[in-house]
Every structure is written in C-alpha cells, then in structure tokens.
Amino acid sequence: EVEKTACPSGKKAREIDESLIFYKKWELEACVDAALLATQMDRVNAIPFTYEQLDVLKHKLDELYPQGYPESVIQHLGYLFLKMSPEDIRKWNVTSLETLKALLEVNKGHEMSPQVATLIDRFVKGRGQLDKDTLDTLTAFYPGYLCSLSPEELSSVPPSSIWAVRPQDLDTCDPRQLDVLYPKARLAFQNMNGSEYFVKIQSFLGGAPTEDLKALSQQNVSMDLATFMKLRTDAVLPLTVAEVQKLLGPHVEGLKAEERHRPVRDWILRQRQDDLDTLGLGLQGGIPNGYLVLDLSMQEALS
C-alpha cells in the first residue's frame, strides 16, 4: 500500500504524458487523478513506465472501480493487463471481440497464463457459446486452445465454428475431445464432395466410428499412416483387411513399420493370418488359419 501524501507543487498531472515516467511511486499516487487515468488509458501503453509505476496505476484504477473495470478501460489496458490477477478479471464483463483481441495481443508469444484463461472463460460465458469469430481469434493466438477445453465445454461449439479450426489446433486433443468434435465436423462439412470432404474431416477422424471409416474406405481417400494411427482403436478393430487396404491406398505399406503400435497391433490380432498375408507386407500375429473366431461382444449383447 502506497501511503497518502500531498502532491508537490506544480506536479499535479493534467494529462497522462511522458513526464510521469520521472515521478516517484508516491508522486504518481498523489498527483495522478484516477478518473484522468481511466479516460486516458490508451496513453499508458505508449509510455515506458517501470513495473513498479504500473503497480501504482493499477492501484488507482482498483480504487476507482472496486466492482471491476468498465470495458472502455479494459480495452486500453495494454501491458497493464499483465498486472491483473485472475480475481481482478473475474469482476470484468468483456463483451467486445476487439477488447479480447487487444488483451490477447499483449500476451502474444507467451504461454496461456491464468489471467488469459480467466479472460477467455469470462468472454465465452458472456457470449453463451463459442461462435466462429471467437474461435477464429482464440485459435489464432493459441493453436492448442480447443484441446484445452473439456468435452462438456466443447459441446457448446456450434458446427458452423468448426470451419475456423485448423489441423494444428487439434494436435493435443485427446479421444474424448475428438468424440465431441467429430460429429460437429461431419455436420459442418456434409455438403462437400468426396476429396474436399476428406481433406477437411481428416484431422477430426480420431473421433470417427467404425461405420464412417467403412464408408470412407469406399471413397479412395488414401489416408496417411499418421491419421490412421490416431483413429480410435475400437473403431479400427472391426475393419476388414480389404477395408483397411482401401482406406490407406498406397499408404498401406506403412502398416509394417507400425505393427507393434496401437491401433495396428490390436487390429492385426483380430485379423485372419491368411487375410493379412494377402497384403504381402509380412505382418505377423493374426489368427492362425483353421481357428474359429467367436465374437464375444455379440454373444453378450444377445444374452
């Protein structure tokens, strides 16, 4: 807490200008009117205040707005935003995408801080859903943003917003998240033709069910191994050797290098060895010829 002292003669600030960088902390406290600061916040960002001086300016704003800053001030916080705590930010009501962009710009190049996470949370909750423009903005600043959301939070993403998602935005998503996103993507891209559809849906396929993979296998899509390796194991297991061959096209040769890794390993264990041999890749570990395969899951379903 900076102690209250009278402003020295001739030092009362009439505007926020560069002369203030030479004020001591107590002089800033005594000589800068909080209301003046609030109306000229856009200037603060252009003046090389020390972090200690910024602390004083923040303190003045906190006194002026104990219930939380108005958006007109928030939009112009600039580097003063880095001084805010998540508790401060929870008091804000941020509705403008321009305000969100301005504050994300300040944090650009850094990891998502607790302050930024709180800001985004406040903004999205205020909007009620993750609309396309918001998602566009957030993934531009934080490619991993989408994958930081819970499946429950992702359920509020409208299918129309999926158009804003780039493949790299899904790099860190786990299967539970892709389970939520895939149906939305399927809906969003449903009117595209085969090859264009596959390009768009490819990065979401970690959430695709068996029947959709079977359908894709009929469309000469030539899925690459990296995509195949991200598919749900339970969705891959029921695929036949012929279906996998059609799904991968020329990339089928890559199965050999991945035969010890899931889902390829588990899929091999479910195939007849003579079917695997038709691929000519030397894949081993299939069901020996002459063995009977019982589908216990089907039996359980019937009982």
Epitope: E15, D17, S19, N45, Y79
Partner: antibody, heavy 116, light 111 residues
Framework: QVQLVQSGAEVKKPGSSVKVSCKAS????????ISWVRQAPGQGLEWMGG????????NYAQKFQGRVTITADESTSTAYMELSSLRSEDTAVYYC?????????WGQGTLVTVSS | DIALTQPASVSGSPGQSITISCTGT?????????VSWYQQHPGKAPKLMIY???NRPSGVSNRFSGSKSGNTASLTISGLQAEDEADYYC???????????FGGGTKLTVL
C-alpha cells in the same frame, strides 16, 4: 501533433562549443520529453540526452556526460543542446525529437560541421 | 550506453517478407514491453513505424508488424515494396540509465 523547428547549420572549430535550438509549437511543451539524437555521416542514430521542461533537469547518455548541456525555456517553448570541446568526429546532423511511445515528432535536423 | 544489436543489412524481393532482429538485455528490451522501430530514408528524419513492441501508429501500413521474445525484438515487413528500402532502427528505453538506446541500424535493400 507538436511541430519542432531547429536552428540552422553551423560550422565550428575544434575545441569550441555549439548551441542548437529547437522551438516547439502545439501541445503542452512543458510536459514533453525532448530528446536530442545525433547522426554522423553514414552512421546510425545516437541518443545524447533529454529533458522535461517543467522539471528542468536533464539526463544524458554516459558518452556525452560532462560535454553536453540540455536546457529548456518554457516561456518560449524552446529546448537547447550545447556541446562543448568539439572534435571532428562530432560532425553530424543533430535532431531534437519528442519520441516516446506513440508520440513521434522530429525536428528537421541541424548539420554541425567541425573543421579547422 | 551499449547499442542494441541489429544485422547490418537485409534484403528481399518485392512481395516477399523480411524480419529484422534487435537484441538487447534484460534491463532494456527484455525487461519492458517498450520497443520502437523507426524507418529512415536518406536525408530525412526518422519516422516511427512501431511503438510498444507491436503497436502501429495511425497511417503506418499493416504490412509492418512487431514482436518480442526474451531479449530480442523483431520487425517484420510483409509484401515488400520498393519504397520500403531504407534504414531501420530499433530503440528502447533503459530504466537503469533513464535514457534511450538505439540499435546500430539495418539497411533494407529491395532487390
């Protein structure tokens, strides 16, 4: 936007002094941070020092400490830069500037030639 | 007063993007989000292109952008044009010495 108009070119002998003026118009001159920046022929920009007129005290780059004096006259909205003990390597264009953050105004520059 | 370190020259063809770096210390570039970039054409006074790391003054083309990582600031010019050929200087305010510091300057040639 503030306008800064500097005094004319000077030719000086080694060992002498030169005083360059910079008159401001528009805005609140007394609160401005007026810098002096020089640029020798074919060289880069070099900050010499600066002043806020209402405070009167200037701060200087270490290199020029003791040889440069920056002052300001609030009544005429004019800043001055005096450089003493001139040597040939002080031949340069000298700029006054209000250049802090978004504030960006430069004088037209004053060529000071030091030659015997 | 140690100058900030900039490459002496960079070049690019029209339409290309170039980046000019500016390396300082933790007490200037790294310590504060206060870095400016100036453009200077021969015989002219410098012109402010970027302030506070990544802010553009009104009237400056959005082809110019700034960023900072650690003790290094960068100016990126996209869609190079012939009129971008000039000298570029970075500058920061050093709170330790209460003064400005300039980079040595970078000559940009548009091929």
């Amino acid at each position: 936007q503030v306008q800064l108009v500097q005094s004319g070119a000077e030719v000086k002998k080694p060992g002498s002094s030169v005083k360059v003026s910079c008159k401001a118009s528009g805005g609140t001159f007394s609160s401005y941070y007026i810098s002096w920046v020089r640029q020798a022929p074919g060289q880069g920009l070099e900050w010499m020092g600066g002043i806020i007129p209402k405070f009167g005290t200037a701060n200087y780059a270490q290199k020029f400490q003791g040889r440069v004096t920056i002052t300001a006259d609030e009544s005429t909205s004019t800043a001055y830069m005096e450089l003493s003990s001139l040597r040939s390597e002080d031949t340069a264009v000298y700029y006054c500037a209000r250049t802090i953050g978004i504030y960006d105004s430069w004088g037209q520059g004053t060529l000071v030639t030091v030659s015997s | 007063d140690i100058a900030l370190t900039q490459p002496a020259s960079v070049s690019g063809s029209p339409g290309q993007s170039i980046t000019i770096s500016c390396t300082g210390t933790s007490s200037d570039v790294g310590g504060y989000n206060y870095v400016s970039w100036y453009q200077q054409h021969p015989g002219k006074a410098p012109k402010l292109m970027i302030y506070s790391v990544n802010n553009r003054p009104s009237g400056v083309s959005n082809r110019f952008s700034g960023s900072k990582s650690g003790n290094t600031a960068s100016l990126t010019i996209s869609g190079l044009q012939a009129e971008d050929e000039a000298d570029y200087y970075c500058s920061t305010y050093d709170h330790t010495s209460s003064g400005f510091v300039f980079g040595g300057g970078t000559k940009l040639t548009v091929l």
